[in-house]
C-alpha cells in the first residue's frame, strides 16, 4: 500500500531520513568575507538524509516520483531532501561608504521535505 | 571562482545535468486505476540529472549548499534536481455517482532547478 508506514516515521533508523541539520560556516567558507561584515560565523540549517518511499512527501508529484522510482529506479530518481521553508537572515554588508543591513529570505532552511 | 562556469551550461556533458524529462506512466503504475478514469496514461515530466557546482541554483541556500558540499562532502550533500514549477493537470475521477473533474496543481513538473 502507498501508506505502508507513516510518512513521518523513518524506516531506516534514527537520523537517517530527511531532516534539518546545523552546519557551522565562516564567512571564509562561504566566500563572503569581502562583502559581509557580520556575522563572522553562521549556524546554517540544511536538509540532509534519505527519502525512503513516501517519507515526508512534498506533494503529489513527490509521491508519484517515489512510486515510479520503485518501478524504474534507473530512469526515475528517488525524491530528495530539500528545504520546505526558510528562516530569514539579516547580514551586515560592507558598502562603498560603510555598512548596511540586508535581510535574506532564502538562506537558512527552517523545515525539510522530500521532493 | 564561484562562477567558473555559467549556471546554465552543463560541465558534465549533454543530458547529464538537472533537466526535465518525460516519463510515461499508466494508471496501474501509479496505483490510481481504482479512482481515476482518464487519462489512462500520463506523460509525466520529472526532474532528473546531477547538480554540479552552482548549476541552476534555486536560491542563495542552494549556492551555499553547493559551496559547503565542496568543502565538507561527507557532511553536506550536493544540491539535487527538483521541480521549480508545475503544470496543472486535469484528472477525471470516479465518484459514487459517476465522474468529476479535478485539477491538480502539483502533479507534473514544468521546470527544474537545483535545491
Amino acid at each position: 500500500s502507498a501508506h505502508a508506514h507513516p510518512r513521518d516515521s523513518c524506516p531506516l533508523g534514527p537520523g537517517r531520513c530527511c531532516h534539518l541539520e546545523t552546519v557551522q560556516a565562516t564567512l571564509e567558507d562561504l566566500g563572503w568575507s569581502d562583502w559581509v561584515l557580520s556575522p563572522r560565523q553562521l549556524q546554517l540549517s540544511m536538509c540532509v538524509g534519505e527519502c525512503p518511499h513516501l517519507y515526508r512527501s512534498a506533494n503529489t508529484h513527490a509521491q508519484i516520483k517515489a512510486r515510479l522510482h520503485g518501478l524504474q529506479p534507473d530512469k526515475v530518481p528517488a525524491p530528495c531532501c530539500v528545504p520546505s521553508s526558510y528562516t530569514p537572515v539579516v547580514l551586515m554588508h560592507r558598502t562603498d561608504s560603510g555598512v548596511s543591513l540586508q535581510t535574506y529570505d532564502d538562506l537558512v532552511a527552517r523545515g525539510c521535505h522530500c521532493a | 571562482s564561484a562562477h567558473a562556469h555559467p549556471r546554465d551550461s552543463c560541465p558534465l556533458g549533454p543530458g547529464r545535468c538537472c533537466h526535465l524529462e518525460t516519463v510515461q506512466a499508466t494508471l496501474e503504475d501509479l496505483g490510481w486505476s481504482d479512482w481515476v478514469l482518464s487519462p489512462r496514461q500520463l506523460q509525466l515530466s520529472m526532474c532528473v540529472g546531477e547538480c554540479p557546482h552552482l548549476y541552476r541554483s534555486a536560491n542563495t541556500h542552494a549556492q551555499i549548499k553547493a559551496r559547503l558540499h565542496g568543502l565538507q562532502p561527507d557532511k553536506v550533500p550536493a544540491p539535487c534536481c527538483v521541480p521549480s514549477s508545475y503544470t496543472p493537470v486535469v484528472l477525471m475521477h470516479r465518484t459514487d455517482s459517476g465522474v468529476s473533474l479535478q485539477t491538480y496543481d502539483d502533479l507534473v513538473a514544468r521546470g527544474c532547478h537545483c535545491a
Epitope: 557580520s38 556575522p39 539579516v90 551586515m92 555598512v99 543591513l101 | -
Partner: antibody, heavy 118, light 107 residues
Framework: QVQLQESGPGLLKPSQTLSLTCTVS??????????VGWIRQPAGKGLEWLAN???????YYNSALKSRLTISKDTSKNQVSLKLSSVTAADTAVYYC??????????WGQGTLVTVSS | DIQMTQSPSTLSASVGDRVTITCKAS??????VAWYQQKPGQPPKALIY???YRYSGVPDRFSGSGSGTDFTLTISSLQAEDVAVYYC?????????FGQGTKLEIK
Amino acid sequence: QVQLQESGPGLLKPSQTLSLTCTVSGFSLSTYGMGVGWIRQPAGKGLEWLANIWWNDDKYYNSALKSRLTISKDTSKNQVSLKLSSVTAADTAVYYCAQEVYGWFAYWGQGTLVTVSS
Amino acid sequence: DIQMTQSPSTLSASVGDRVTITCKASQNVGTNVAWYQQKPGQPPKALIYSASYRYSGVPDRFSGSGSGTDFTLTISSLQAEDVAVYYCQQYNSYPLTFGQGTKLEIK
C-alpha cells in the same frame, strides 16, 4: 521601514512592577541575527543597557539588575516585553527599545517616560 | 563588566572644525565598538559599526577608528546640525556597556 514603539504605564508607585511593551514593524523577530534590546536613560544622564532577546530566544541581562528583570517576546504579535520588579525612584527614566543586530542598536524607538513616585 | 570611558565630557568647537572624541575600553574589545548620536529630545541614532564602518545614510564627515582598547570618533568638518551627545558602546561581551557620553556644542 523599521519602526519600534514603546508603551508603558507612565507612572508607578515604589515596589510595583514595571511592564513595558515594544511593538515592532518592518522586520521579523524570528529573523536570524535579529534581536531587540531595552536601554534606559534617566533625565540628563547617559544610556544604560538593560536586557535583550534574540531571534532564537537567547536572553541577556544587565548584571546589576538581573534579579529584577524579565524579557520575553511574542513573535506572532511582533512584540517584546520587559518587566522590572520592585521599582524605586532610581528607576525613573526614559525607556527605549531598539533593534539589535549582531550587538549594536541599528534603530531605536522614540522612548517612553516612566516615573516612579509615591 | 567592561567600562567604556569617553573624553572629553563636553566639547565646544566652531563650525568647520575637525572634532575628535575618544573612548577607552577597560579591556580588549577588538573592533566591537559602535558610536551613536543623540540630539536633544530624540532617541540615539546609529553612526558607526565595528569601530570604523559608517552606517548607511550617515554623512561621510563622520568616521571611526581604533581597535583593542582605544577608539576615536572624528567629525572632519563640524556642522551646526551635529550638536548632540555622542556615545560609544562595546558589544564584545555581555553586559553591553556605553560610555558616559560627550556633549558637543558649537562655539
